[in-house]
């Protein structure tokens, strides 16, 4: 299945964080979502063939990339309290 690391993370405001997602073998598309109690599930961005194909309405502090082996990373710089959330990754063909 899809593997995300780390499972849990505690950071202080102003720090940066990098989350990793390994898709199902053979899947070329990886999408990232942010889930919060207040806003529900919000789309961050989608990568396909190592390229960002779509992006949601998030500030430039949120960025990502996809490596040649399809693994993806998302990065949040200068963390704010409102960034506390569950970050989900999904993969597809």
């Amino acid at each position: 299945g899809v593997t995300q690391t780390p499972r849990y993370l505690i950071k202080t405001r102003g720090q940066q964080v990098t989350l990793s997602c390994s898709p199902i073998s053979g899947h070329r598309s990886v999408s990232w979502y942010q889930q919060t109690p207040g806003q529900g599930l919000q789309f961050l961005f989608e990568y396909f063939s190592e390229t960002q194909r779509n992006k949601g309405n998030f500030p430039g502090r949120f960025s990502g990339r996809q490596f040649s082996n399809s693994r993806s990373e998302m990065n949040v710089s200068t963390l704010e309290l409102g960034d506390s959330a569950l970050y989900l990754c999904a993969s597809s063909l």
């Epitope: 990568y47 396909f48 063939s49 190592e50 390229t51 960002q52 194909r53 779509n54 992006k55 430039g60 960025s63 990502g64 990339r65 996809q66 490596f67 040649s68 082996n69 990373e73």
Partner: antibody
Framework: EVQLQQSGPVLVKPGASVRMSCKAS????????IHWVKQSHGRSLEWVGY????????GYNQKFKAKATLTVDKSSSTAYMDLRSLTSEDSAVYYC???????????WGQGTTLTVSS | EIVLTQSPAITAASLGQKVTITCSAS?????MHWYQQKSGTSPKPWIY???KLASGVPARFSGSGSGTSYSLTISSMEAEDAAIYYC?????????FGAGTKLELK
Amino acid sequence: EVQLQQSGPVLVKPGASVRMSCKASGYTFTDYNIHWVKQSHGRSLEWVGYINPYNGRTGYNQKFKAKATLTVDKSSSTAYMDLRSLTSEDSAVYYCARWDGSSYFDYWGQGTTLTVSS
Amino acid sequence: EIVLTQSPAITAASLGQKVTITCSASSSVSYMHWYQQKSGTSPKPWIYEISKLASGVPARFSGSGSGTSYSLTISSMEAEDAAIYYCQQWNYPLLTFGAGTKLELK
């Protein structure tokens, strides 16, 4: 330090073929796609295509599909571009560039100058 | 194919002058990137993802825009800024560059 070292200038006759190389160092070669870009004399940049060094998958600008073939040698961390049926229109500087994994080129080679002349 | 139109094609600025280069896309794009190229050298990443400065780029440079209209601005022209600037976008599966803007020192 990330570096993309390209092969030297080439002079060939019309109708010939040529291979140019791009040797990567300073990072894991199979992590990032390598793209090729053409710059004709005094003109803008044209995207030729890319290769995924991890699995060999390629993508081409339709304009160059019959002209260019992209390959890699993982053991030497080197990407290659073969150009065939050369004409004077193919005379240009060709750059290899590393794709950042999202939407732009974060490192470029120094370029290979190709001159096609009889 | 998304066509990128840069304007002006050539411009000259005096030291300390504010400079703005624009890049217009034929269809909406998510991101625009800018490269600087000086004579006889390879392009360098200059501004990426619309407004992020690449490593080593002076703070007098900035980028902005959305949809089909993007710009690169130099708040105060310096001699070392004289170069050609190219915009670039990637709309899968085709990547395109603008024709370039040549910035000269007046």
